[in-house]
């Protein structure tokens, strides 16, 4: 069962089991009321581990369009603009929830899906394996 | 009208308007079939812009637990372990979709919500504003 005290104004549900089918209002509420001034969209160019953004579109998914990061270099960019291959540019990945149309092409029926997306890149010290 | 060639096996929907309420199966399908060996969980320590992970829990949200990154330093860590304040550690943020119980405490009724989460940190060259 679900661990939440029931609100008497809740919609009825035929299936009380978990996993279960729920009603979701797709009118997205935006918690980020104001544009965050510290949220820069040019980090991908200014980072020592810069990345490019690749467009991934799937009409059977909600959201249909996801922009994915791909690190530009294996190494990290130094102050002089050259790449330091003693360091590694690596993607920072996150598992996010998306909705997948199920059955396919159905406008009002979805299944939750977990996908792994690369959000940006960071510069890390490599793990060095010493051979005995 | 709704923008998808209708599959005859789709559930009925009373409201065809946009925005609309849809059915979602919460039995999560995981697209990431195998654990990605390159998806390292120690980047937060090995990065030149290391971060700590903070647990954010909200029982009215699905998923109820989200881990948020907070950069450890204003500057970036150099090879000698000291912090270089001529560079900046900045959070890489992403807007993600979550489900918010609506009305509150209802187990089977949600609304999509967009929230901004910090996934990790990257080291960037600062923007220098020159005063004339």
């Amino acid at each position: 069962g679900i661990a939440i005290p029931r609100n008497s104004g809740c919609p009825n549900s035929e299936d009380k089991n978990f996993p279960r089918t729920v009603m979701v209002n797709l009118n997205i509420h935006n918690r980020n009321t104001s544009t965050n001034p510290k949220r820069s969209s040019d980090y991908y160019n200014r980072s020592t581990s810069p990345w490019n953004l690749h467009r991934n579109e799937d009409p059977e998914r909600y959201p249909s369009v996801i922009w994915e990061a791909k690190c530009r270099h294996l190494g990290c960019v130094k102050a002089d603009g050259n790449v330091d291959y003693h360091m590694n540019s690596v993607p920072i990945q996150q598992e996010i929830l998306v909705l997948r149309r199920e059955p396919r092409h159905c406008p009002n029926s979805f299944r939750l899906e977990k996908i792994l997306v690369s959000v940006g890149c960071t510069c890390v010290t490599p793990i060095v394996h010493h051979v005995a | 009208g709704i923008a998808i060639p209708r599959n005859s096996g789709c559930p009925n929907s009373e409201d065809k308007n946009f925005p609309r309420t849809v059915m979602v199966n919460l039995n999560i399908h995981n697209r990431n079939t195998s654990t990605n060996p390159k998806r390292s969980s120690d980047y937060y320590n090995r990065s030149t812009s290391p971060w700590n992970l903070h647990r954010n829990e909200d029982p009215e949200r699905y998923p109820s637990v989200i881990w948020e990154a907070k950069c450890r330093h204003l500057g970036c860590v150099k090879a000698d372990g000291n912090v270089d304040y001529h560079m900046n550690s900045v959070p890489i943020q992403q807007e993600i979709l979550v489900l918010r119980r609506e009305p509150r405490h209802c187990p089977n009724s949600f609304r999509l919500e967009k929230i901004l989460v910090s996934v990790g940190c990257t080291c960037v060259t600062p923007i220098v504003h020159h005063v004339a």
Partner: antibody, heavy 121, light 106 residues
Framework: EVQLVQSGAEVKKPGSSVKVSCKAS????????IHWVRQAPGQGLEWIGV????????FYNQKFDGRATLTADKSTSTAYMELSSLRSEDTAVYYC??????????????WGQGTTVTVSS | EIVLTQSPDFQSVTPKEKVTITCSAS?????IYWFQQKPDQSPKRWIY???ELASGVPSRFSGSGSGTDYTLTINSLEAEDAATYYC?????????FGQGTKLEIK
């Protein structure tokens, strides 16, 4: 009311650059990508590329890659298209149009009024 | 690049007549989109995702097709339908448009 209002007509010399703006209002700017399409006099429509104001991502029709630069300013809900190394064949009406990121089935639903760019020596 | 070929290029039609515009794709695509454009105006989204009429589009219009062959049909042409119609695909980059079909009222 959703509106995409573009900057005024431009006359440019060959080899120079032009920057067209597209100010959006009446919706959440970052929920939609901005696509750019052009139409040469008496001709059909040609897709230039896309900018995602949310992530800063861009993707171009290869024909324009390297010459077109698409940007957006979230603080003013304005998208920009800059085209460099102009030649006479770039004389066209340039349109911005929005595209819903969450449900792409809706396609390009609202268009700007168009900006005429004339390239002439 | 996927080439969209519309037929006919031009059609002069009498009011109340049925009109069919076809759009043939050089490779299979998922959906087709149709835009209407009148002289000195921006294109208007007319039919989206092959079948769906955009808001305000009269019900005399319909869209159909799959794979490589798509159709826009006007059941009973009216004077206000005089315009150029473009088909559009976004299944493959670069996104492309048909050359347009100009409808004229006799």
């Amino acid at each position: 009311e959703v509106q995409l209002v573009q900057s005024g007509a431009e006359v440019k010399k060959p080899g120079s650059s032009v920057k067209v703006s597209c100010k959006a209002s009446g919706y959440t700017f970052t929920d939609y990508e901005i696509h750019w399409v052009r139409q040469a006099p008496g001709q059909g429509l040609e897709w230039i590329g896309v900018n995602d104001p949310e992530s800063g991502g861009t993707f171009y029709n290869q024909k324009f890659d390297g010459r077109a630069t698409l940007t957006a300013d979230k603080s003013t809900s304005t998208a920009y298209m800059e085209l460099s190394s102009l030649r006479s064949e770039d004389t066209a009406v340039y349109y911005c149009t929005r595209y819903y990121r969450y449900e792409s089935f809706y396609g390009m639903d609202y268009w700007g009024q168009g900006t005429t760019v004339t390239v002439s020596s | 690049e996927i080439v969209l070929t519309q037929s006919p290029d031009f059609q002069s039609v009498t009011p109340k007549e049925k009109v069919t515009i076809t759009c043939s794709a050089s490779s299979s695509i998922s959906y087709i989109y149709w835009f209407q454009q009148k002289p000195d105006q921006s294109p208007k989204r007319w039919i989206y995702a092959t079948f769906e009429l955009a808001s305000g589009v009269p019900s005399r219009f319909s869209g159909s097709g799959s794979g490589t062959d798509y159709t826009l049909t006007i059941n009973s042409l009216e004077a206000e339908d005089a315009a150029t119609y473009y088909c559009h695909q976004r299944s493959s980059y670069p996104w492309t448009f048909g050359q347009g079909t100009k409808l004229e009222i006799k």
